[in-house]
Every structure is written in C-alpha cells, then in structure tokens.
C-alpha cells in the first residue's frame, strides 16, 4: 500500500482511484496514510465520487480512518438511508494522521469511474471544543499554528499541567477586628489545584470568632474524610477540621488572637466553596460613667480591647485631669480589661482673677471672687482722672476661659486720661505773674537737657513742646530728663519720666526762624494721672472761638522772672491774644527779619509789656479754657519773643497748635 507524503514535506495533494478518470478494476485495494505535523490535522474532500452502491457499502467502498476510529465508509453516488456518499462534505482527521482505504469487490454490474479527492494539512484550533466537552484551558486559551497555550486571570497562576489555573490565594493577613474571607471566586466555583492560606492576626488580648455564613460546598466523599478538597483552621492551641461537604460548620471560638485558614483543592469538581465572617472579642473594660457635666462618646453596649471613648464637657465646663486642664480626653481599653487613663472631671470653666486694669479697678458682680463660667465683672476707671474708651466695662466669663466684653473683645478696656482738668478757674482778669498752686497746671512738664525748658503732657505718655527746646537732643532722646507732678523746680519730689523718642516737625529749621516750632516727645512709660499730673487737651475744631483777639490765655513755667533768675516755683501769667497783624508789624522792624511772624504763630501779651513768658519757659503751653467742655486746651506753645521779656510794644510768640492737629494725631497714632 503506497504511503502518502510524510511531514516535514508539504502536506497537500490529490488522491484518485486506480485508472481514474477511467473505470476502476475489480478486486482492487489501495491504502493511503497521510501524516501532518504535530498540532495539525488533515482535511479531505472529494471532487468526484462514483462507486458501486451496495447495502452498508459492503461491495465497493472508500473508508476514512483516523487512528482507531473510522470516520466514514463511503459508496454510491448519493447518500441513502443506510449508505453514505461524500457529496460536498469535508472530512477531518482526529489527530495528525488520516488513513484512506479504497476497495472494489470481484464484480461490477456496470462500469464505475471511482473517485478523485484532495487533501491538505491545516492547523487544529484546540481552543474550540464541542458542546459538553471540557474546555481545553481553565481560563484563557490561545491557539497558534501547530498548537495552543493556556493563560490565567490576574490572581491565578498556571499549574504545571499547563491547563489548570491555580489561585494565588496565600499570604493574605487580616488585622481588622472583624471581617470576611471566602474561597476564591465565591459564590462561583472555586479554582482547581489550589492551596490557599489566610491569616487572621489581631493584637494580643483579642480572641477570634469564626462564623461560616451563606453556603458551604466543598467536594467530599461518602466514605473517606475530605480526600479531595478541604478546609482546615489552625490556631496556636488547636486545629479545627478538615471541613468539606455541604453543611455549614458550627461557630468556632478560637480563644486565640491568631488563626491560619488553609484551603486545598484538587484537579476536579465544581463546587461553590465557603464564606467566613470573623469577629473578635476581648475582656471588656468597666463601663465608663460620664463625669457630672460631661458625656461619653461613642456610646456602646460594651467596650473591649482597643475600643475607646471620649469625654465631652457641657458648654462652660472643661476637662481636668487632677489639676491639669486637657484639650481633649480619649481613653483606650487595654488587654487586661482596664482603661489606659483615669476618668477626668468636667470642671466649670474658671476665667481666673481678672487682670488688673491700669488706672482702673474691677468689681465682682456675680459674687465676691466668683470667676467661673457666666460670672460677670465690671471694670471701671479711676474717677475724675480717667475715662473708659468705647467699652461699657462689663465682662463675662465665657466657655473659652476668657473674660469677654459685650462686644466680644477679650482685651482689657482702656482707661484714657481725662484731659484739661485744673484746680484753677479764670475770672478773665489780667494780673501779674504769680505762683501756681497745686493742681493749677498739672500738665506742666519740666525738661532738663542742657537747658531748662518746659512742655505739656498729652495723654499719659506724650509731651508736647517746642522744637527749638529739644532740637539738640533729637538723636539722643534718653538724655532728656523729664519731670512732672511738682511745682518746685528744685524739689526731689517729682515724677521722673524718660524719653523714648523725639519727633521734631519736619518743617522746622533750627537757627532759621521759628516757623513750625513744635515737637513731640514719646515717654518710655505711661505716667500715673492724678491731681498733680493730668494731660492738657488738644484744641477741638471749634477751639478758634475761644482764641480770638483779646481772649485770655495762661502761660506757665519756671523761666526767668523779673529778677533775672529761673523761678524756683512754677509761675503763671494770664495774657490776652494779640491781633495777628499788630503782632506781625511789631516784629517787622529790626533786628527782626521780615516774615518772622507766620500764620503758624499766635501772639499774646500786653502792649504795655510786663506780662510775658521768658527763657526757660520755652515749650510750655499757652492754655485756654473751653467754656463748653469746661476743659483747658493747649492753644499755643511758648516759642520766641523780644530779647527783653515783657518789653512794651513786643509780644510773646507762640506756635499755633490748632494748625498741627493732623501732624500730632499722625505721630501719636503711628508710634
């Protein structure tokens, strides 16, 4: 019997009955064996077929076999109920080889032309399986010329049998106090040939409880205990299982904080697996009883290891551990069943003794010394000499532990000195310079620093003076010795103040006239206001109405007296304002340069002379009484005048303060 072509030769060709296309002879037997490469099959079809028809093709036939299996026995020209002719059918080998046998018997009733067939090798698609047959691969099948290969979904690995996908299901560690774990793909069938290990690892002190839930279906055997697939549960104390079958195992209270669950499957079966819900328990801690005026959160039926609660105090109460205030409080249950921290107290917020108010006092309204939540205190300023600035002085102890004003301010109110108070009243008469009495000029400041000069207290930490009086000290403010609260120039009983900074008007030019002869001294500390030390007021917008020609102003100082010496006691003089044109004219004749008197100056004195300020009075205030407010204000600053003080026809010249209110306010607000 001739052999067909052998691989690796190209596997394709033609087969025909002997003598084709002529009739075939009797008693013929011809066999062809076709072999394709591994992974290939053979395809065969007929282009001509004409054989004697006989019952079950017993006489003449073509038989197609693949291995031990007969694929077809063919005869006739067309198929009948019991015989088959190939017609347009294509035939495929089952493997890589195909046997074709042609046989004719001893006789033919008429001539038959036989057959012609063509064959070729083609790739087998191993991934295509007939319905009902097991799939080639567990997950993904990939066909290629001459073969195929399998691959797996993520989380699986190809078994060494190259077809099965084993689950990558080991090494999972559960550390939460409760959770769920299940067989891979649950509730779909679990994978074959897999070995899964799951660990539950909780902190020492916890005990794991396992509950099998929903369904349980693991391949089993009627006689042998779990020979195929099984589930085992291992703790440091004991082993539970193996488990298989369809019955949910009972709850397992492991009394252990670590559990290992092992699940092993074989190569066969179709079962849905299992699901475990695990919880944990521990020795409970004593139930936390909230302190008075506090509450526990969260509220639980019981608290076990790692459970925690916080204490929150009612508004107006604060957490205290012993005597120490806490920002927050959280206690954690420990493995021995005790809380890690003792219960705090919710103590009523105590704002503590209120701060002292400089130049003021505080009164307890709620009760003597009561400083707790909602307590009320009342600040007030020292009467007569201080007044409270934009505040009613009422403060309440709020929940944040701060005394808070009705406007929500936590800062103290401010006691501002009352300005312009004097023990002296003026009758409007002019009389000779005389000794001041205590409280007459409480704003009077003595400035020593090379020369003797004067100034006037503004607020409680500024001194208004003449620029020429402090010019030499502008860069060495600390050299100024500032004294107040005394009438006697040589008394040691003065209040000492020291300069922090000297601000000379930028328009003042030293030794070139006295325009803008104004300066401010900032004190390094606030002075205490009393009947002997009180600031002078700055002029109001309306002040010009009290400073018209012939209105009386008062100048005070320790300057030279008629005897030519500095006064030992503070002296004062009441003098009228002089018409500006008259004053300008008085200082236009030599030795005074033209323009000596400017619009920034005012003049005061008697035409007849004798009443004047003099050297040593420089920088002092020329004050006026505001009859509407009944407060004294500074209208002028002692600046300059004739060489001979009190000379007839000459006047004292003073810096006109009302022209400098913006300058004064800017400096005081900026510094």
């Amino acid at each position: 019997t001739p052999l067909g072509p052998k691989w690796p030769e190209p596997v394709f060709g033609r087969l025909a009955s002997p003598g084709f296309p002529g009739e075939y002879a009797n008693d013929q037997e011809r066999r062809w064996t076709l072999t394709a490469p591994p992974g290939y099959r053979l395809r065969l079809y007929f282009t001509h077929f004409d054989l004697e028809l006989s019952h079950l093709c017993e006489y003449d036939f073509v038989k197609l076999s693949s291995g031990a299996k007969v694929l077809a026995t063919l005869c006739g020209q067309e198929s009948t109920d019991t015989e088959r002719a190939p017609g347009k059918d294509t035939f495929y080998s089952l493997g890589s080889s195909l046997d074709i046998t042609f046989r004719s018997d001893y006789s033919n009733e008429k001539p038959f032309t036989g057959f012609e067939a063509f064959y070729a090798a083609e790739d087998i698609d191993e991934c295509q399986v007939a319905p009902g047959e097991a799939p080639t691969c567990d997950h993904h099948c990939h066909n290629h010329l001459g073969g195929f290969y399998c691959s797996c979904r993520a989380g699986y690995v190809l078994h060494r049998n190259k077809r099965t996908c084993s689950a990558l299901c080991s090494g999972q560690v559960f550390t939460q106090r409760s959770g769920e774990l299940s067989s891979p793909e649950y509730p779909r069938p679990y994978p074959k040939l897999s070995s899964c290990t799951y660990s539950i690892s909780l902190e020492e002190g916890f005990s794991v409880i396992l509950d099998f839930v929903e369904s349980f279906d693991v391949e089993t055997h009627p006689e042998t205990l779990c020979p195929y697939d099984f589930l085992k549960i291992q703790t440091d104390r004991e082993e539970h299982g193996p488990f298989c079958g369809k019955t949910l195992p009972h709850r397992i209270e492991t009394k252990s904080n670590t559990v290992t669950i092992t699940f092993v499957t074989d190569e066969s079966g179709d079962h849905t697996g299992w699901k475990i819900h695990y919880t944990s328990t521990a020795q409970p801690c004593p139930y936390p009883m909230a302190p008075p005026n506090g509450h526990v959160s969260p509220v639980q039926a019981k608290y076990i290891l790692k459970d925690s609660f916080s204490i929150f105090c009612e508004t107006g109460y604060e957490l205290l551990q012993g005597h120490l205030p806490l920002k927050s409080f959280t206690a954690v249950c420990q493995k021995d069943g005790s809380w890690d921290r003792p219960m705090p107290a919710c103590s009523i917020v105590d704002c503590g003794p209120p701060d002292d108010l400089p130049s003021g006092r505080v009164e307890y309204i709620t009760g003597p010394g009561v400083t707790t939540y909602k307590a009320v205190i009342q600040y007030s300023c020292e009467e007569t000499f201080y007044t409270m600035k934009v505040n009613d002085g009422k403060y309440v102890c709020e929940a944040d532990g701060f005394w808070t004003s009705s406007k929500g301010e936590k800062s103290l109110p401010v006691c501002e000195p009352v300005c312009g108070l004097s023990a002296r009243t003026t009758g409007g008469r002019i009389y000779g310079g005389q000794k001041a009495k205590p409280g007459d000029f409480p704003w009077q400041v003595l400035i020593l620093g090379g020369t003797t000069a004067a100034g006037a207290l503004l607020y409680d930490n500024w001194v208004l003076t003449a620029a020429h009086a402090v010019y030499e000290q502008k860069h060495d403010a600390s050299a100024l010795d500032i004294r107040m609260g005394t009438l006697k120039r040589l008394s040691p009983h003065y209040t000492q103040a020291w300069s922090e900074a000297v601000f000379i008007h930028e328009g003042y030019t030293h030794d070139a006239g006295f325009d803008n002869d104004i300066a401010l001294i900032k004190l390094n500390n606030k002075v205490v206001i009393n009947s002997n030390i009180t600031p002078i007021c700055l002029p109001r917008k309306e002040a010009e109405s009290f400073m018209r020609t012939d209105d009386i102003g008062t100048a005070s100082g320790w300057g030279l007296t008629q005897r030519g010496f500095l006064a030992r006691n503070l002296m004062y003089v009441d003098i009228p304002i002089v018409d500006h044109q008259k004053c300008t004219a008085a200082y236009e004749k030599p030795p005074y340069p033209r323009g000596s008197v400017t619009a920034n100056m005012l003049c005061a004195g008697l035409e007849s002379g004798g009443k004047d300020s003099c050297r040593g009075d420089s920088g002092g205030a020329l004050v006026f009484l505001d009859s509407e407010t009944e407060r004294w204000f500074v209208g002028g600053i002692v600046s300059w005048g004739s060489m001979n003080c009190g000379e007839a026809g000459q006047y004292g010249v003073y810096t006109k303060v009302i022209n400098y209110i913006p300058w004064i306010e800017n400096i005081i607000s900026d510094f």
């Epitope: 010795d481 006697k488 040589l490 008394s491 040691p492 009983h493 003065y494 000492q496 020291w498 030992r568």
Partner: antibody
Framework: QVQLVQSGAEVKKPGASVKVSCKAS????????MHWLRQAPGQGLEWIGD????????HYIEKFKDRATLTIDKSSSTAYMELSSLRSEDTAVYYC??????????????WGQGTLVTVSS | DIQLTQSPSSLSASVGDRVTITCSAS?????MYWYQQKPGKAPKLLIY???NLASGVPSRFSGSGSGTDNTLTISSLQPEDFATYYC?????????FGQGTKVEIK
C-alpha cells in the same frame, strides 16, 4: 566750708519724744532740702523724710507719717527732727543730710555727724 | 518699694586689689548713688547719677551699670578704703538703700 552739726546723744524712755537739731553753715540754707535718715545698730540706712528750707514743705515716708515732725528755723539755719511715741526699735543713729540741687536732687552731698538716740526703760 | 540687694555682703581684700561691688534692683532704676561709711562716721557720697565722681573722691572709684544691675569698682584698694559701701536709688518713691557691703583687710 559746708557743714552740718547735729545735737548730742539722747537717752529716752519708751513713749517719750526726742528732738534732734542740725545746724547748717557754709551755704544758703533756704536753697536746699534737708533730709533725715537713721541707722539702727549694725543695720543699713533708712530714710525718714525731708523738709524744704525755703517754705517748710515736708514729706515723710508712710512709716513715720504719724510720729515724725520736721521743722526749720531759718534765722539760725537749723533743722529739727522730732520723733514721738518712742519704742525700743527706734534706737538708732539719726542723720541729717543736705539734698543736692545740681542734677537729680535725689542724693545727699553733705551729712551731719549723727546723733545716737537710745530708747530704753 | 524697690529693693536693692548688694553682693557680696562682705569681702576680704588686700591693698592694691581690684574690688567690685554689685547692686541689683528689684526693678529698673535710672540712676544709682554710692556712699562710703567708716565705723562711727556719717556716710560720704562717692558716686552720683550712676557714674559721676563726687567732688574730692579719688579716681580709683568708678560706677557703672543700667537698668537693674549697677556696679561700684575700686581699681586699686588703698588702706583708707576699708569701710562699708551702700548703694541708693530714688527712681521710684520712696528712696531706698542696699543692705551694705563691708570691705575688710585680708
């Protein structure tokens, strides 16, 4: 030269009064303040108060307000310090001292020699 | 009242030694004054306004400091300098003295 001469030592019984004098010379008495201080045996210095010799204005520290009286006699340029209701703890050397008038006015440039006052029953 | 604390309370030194006495105030003072007192005698002004030497006082005496800390220094101790030294302030009423520092012969 400038000098302050104090009166001699005194021994007094508790409850009694003592008056110590201090005569100034060598300067214009009324231009200065006269201060009084004391020093208990083995102790430091303690200020009592002062008087302005020009107008007799006085200042006392709180402790001595009710018991000390400072006076002057301009004609003799003498200052006096009287302490009443004496008790044993008033035993001390009492000094008069002139207040400076050149700078701060707050220190003592000339001192008397001191007067020992002993209070004993 | 401002408290003045002198240190040391006493010291032993030899002729020619440099001696420093400190006076610490309980709050800031502008000026400090120093006096020397010998046994049985009245105090004598040495230094005024912190650092100015009083009339007739030898230049070996000097004063320095500011705020709360002031110092009296004797650059080269002489036999006549063995005495008790006091600091005094009147920046704040009432005026107060230190407790004294006794300088003795070693």
């Amino acid at each position: 030269q400038v000098q302050l001469v104090q009166s001699g030592a005194e021994v007094k019984k508790p409850g009694a009064s003592v008056k110590v004098s201090c005569k100034a010379s060598g300067y214009t008495f009324t231009n200065y303040h006269m201060h009084w201080l004391r020093q208990a045996p083995g102790q430091g210095l303690e200020w009592i108060g002062d008087i302005d010799a020009s107008d007799s204005e006085t200042h006392y520290i709180e402790k001595f307000k009710d018991r000390a009286t400072l006076t002057i006699d301009k004609s003799s340029s003498t200052a006096y310090m009287e302490l009443s209701s004496l008790r044993s703890e008033d035993t001390a050397v009492y000094y008069c001292a002139r207040g400076d008038i050149t700078t701060t006015l707050r220190y003592f440039d000339v001192w008397g020699q001191g007067t020992l006052v002993t209070v004993s029953s | 009242d401002i408290q003045l604390t002198q240190s040391p309370s006493s010291l032993s030194a030899s002729v020619g030694d440099r001696v420093t006495i400190t006076c610490s105030a309980s709050s800031s003072v502008r000026y400090m004054y120093w006096y020397q007192q010998k046994p049985g005698k009245a105090p004598k002004l040495l230094i005024y306004d912190t650092s100015n030497l009083a009339s007739g006082v030898p230049s070996r005496f000097s004063g320095s400091g500011s705020g709360t800390d002031n110092t009296l220094t004797i650059s080269s101790l002489q036999p006549e300098d063995f005495a008790t030294y006091y600091c005094q302030q009147w920046s704040s009423y009432p005026l107060t003295f230190g407790q004294g520092t006794k300088v003795e012969i070693k």
